[in-house]
Interface confidence: low
Amino acid sequence: KIDACKRGDVTVKPSHVILLGSTVNITCSLKPRQGCFHYSRRNKLILYKFDRRINFHHGHSLNSQVTGLPLGTTLFVCKLACINSDEIQICGAEIFVGVAPEQPQNLSCIQKGEQGTVACTWERGRDTHLYTEYTLQLSGPKNLTWQKQCKDIYCDYLDFGINLTPESPESNFTAKVTAVNSLGSSSSLPSTFTFLDIVRPLPPWDIRIKFQKASVSRCTLYWRDEGLVLLNRLRYRPSNSRLWNMVNVTKAKGRHDLLDLKPFTEYEFQISSKLHLYKGSWSDWSESLRAQTPEEEPTGMLDVWYMKRHIDYSRQQISLFWKNLSVSEARGKILHYQVTLQELTGGKAMTQNITGHTSWTTVIPRTGNWAVAVSAANSKGSSLPTRINIMNLCEAGLLAPRQVSANSEGMDNILVTWQPPRKDPSAVQEYVVEWRELHPGGDTQVPLNWLRSRPYNVSALISENIKSYICYEIRVYALSGDQGGCSSILGNSKHKAPLSGPHINAITEEKGSILISWNSIPVQEQMGCLLHYRIYWKERDSNSQPQLCEIPYRVSQNSHPINSLQPRVTYVLWMTALTAAGESSHGNEREFCLQGKAN
């Protein structure tokens, strides 16, 4: 009933709860003396479905047959309409449309852990749209039965609250779930199981790892399990990997030796448990243990390269460079690099530990035969030393690679190509391609990059530390025994016209000609490799085209003579620079008048 229904009643036949597709009869009737005042014949009863008028009738009662009601709840309200007054609500009723429960499917029961309680889940099937009660029944040996009811709207889980024990692990238990509502009932197929079938062990806990004698090769994983566990699965992976290594073990009794871990690597470990070889289910994975394996001494050898610079007649500067070992080669934190410099004939040697750098510079005599050895050390030991004889890398002209070229190859890559040296090409043991940012001052602090190439290769793609709009000095060395030859070229990965022209800083007169001196364009304004400078001049106040002189770019050059100026004529001079992409804007303008005699 919707309200007190003082004025009349609404009755529903056959029931307020009906099966989807059924017809229902709704009757609205007025109680005595509750019609329109003086005009009982004028009573107009109106039936509403929610807010929509579906039927009306003059008199004391109204009958309506309703079909096609949707699943769920529909509200019907009966109202009385009298002349010259608002409609008055008489009474109302809710009709519940639903279906009988379907047979519950896939009933499955589980007990989480040996001390847990039995809980079952099932699939309800389609929604009944009606209040439906589920009863779960469990029967066991010795006619024991347990029952639990569930009155939630969406009930598909029930916990019996009882604990199955392993005293008779092969004893059978049978579970069944029954769904009941006003329109019918249905029971699941029975599910029969034993203790071993349904007990799902708790995940292992208290996971620890021990490295005997701080060695990765003697590693044991420990954990704790419930008492009846027979099988374990272990999975582990480096923390930065997505792929797991899996191991199955039987009767592990809470420990397992791992033999294939990499040194100095953080691993994630998880373990799962099972009570029986083919019955029951695996536990959830344990919480992850993260642990870092100990260091081992480095493997591999450092890639070492060097540069020689003449200081004076008796001394030379040696700069050594080396690349970090890969993580898998370093096998730990590299604490220092050990550099040994030795004069081979006299046997003099000096050793130095370098920390925090991958380069070392020293000054040695120009005489004698010198060799270096470089190794990397972590807490467990050192890598095998890389030994290099210091030689004049460009001394053997016949070993110089020929036709060296450098071309842009996509973003921030340069393709270097060459032809083998004229001397027997089969004598070449390897090529080394070296590159560094071009600095006009020949700055030795500029980082050096290199890569090694096999003797049958005649090209190399350089991409490490290559920036756009920067010019690189590239050298290709051919190495053969204790000899080397080299060729060099300038190259860039991307270029555009320089942002500014050279700044003329002085013009001096020398025997009827002039010498122009300029400052180099700042590296960040060169926008690639410079090919030429141009010097422009024209008579002051003249509208004629300027004359120009084009000079090939050389790193060290910053002056040039011009001898075609007329004496006692004032000229305006300026300079530009060119890359392969075009010419810069003008540098500063300078005026000059040659004082020499006219011819």
């Epitope: 620890r208 790892i209 490295f211 243990l289 642990a291 870092q292 100990p294 260091e295 807490s379």
Partner: nanobody, 125 residues
Framework: EVQLVESGGGLVQPGGSLILSCAVS????????IAWFRQTPGHEREGVSS????????YYADSVKGRFSISRDNAKNMVYLQMNSLKPEDTAVYTC??????????????????WGQGTQVTVSS
């Protein structure tokens, strides 16, 4: 032989700070963990914070997160516990403990074979 010696305990007012030090000797590699535990009369030892010497990874119990900070000085073989915003309930004997291996986490006292003698910290107004 592994030895641990704590220092730095004392009386401090609520809201104050204190630094505990643990001098470590006798380990033959960096693969060990130093942990600080505390204990009040009638209660079990509680793991407060730990640090893995090899890489400096740290762990803190929920009760001290954001207030305590653990650090190491490998050159001096020292581990420090900086305790800020101290509360009366932080009053306890603080002891540093050590074990070989790289497992971090709170750990139970029985997992640590090496212990210092302890230092008293009292937080009171």
């Amino acid at each position: 032989e592994v030895q641990l010696v704590e220092s730095g305990g004392g009386l401090v007012q609520p809201g104050g700070s204190l630094i505990l030090s643990c001098a470590v000797s006798g380990f033959t590699s960096d693969y060990y963990v130093i942990a600080w535990f505390r204990q009040t009369p009638g209660h079990e030892r509680e793991g407060v914070s730990s640090i893995r010497i090899g890489d400096g990874a740290t762990y803190y119990a929920d009760s001290v997160k954001g207030r305590f900070s653990i650090s190491r000085d490998n050159a001096k073989n020292m581990v420090y516990l900086q305790m800020n915003s101290l509360k009366p309930e932080d009053t306890a004997v603080y002891t540093c403990a050590a074990r070989y291996d790289t497992l971090l986490g709170g750990g139970r006292p029985r997992e640590f074979p090496y212990w210092g003698q302890g230092t008293q910290v009292t937080v009171s107004s």
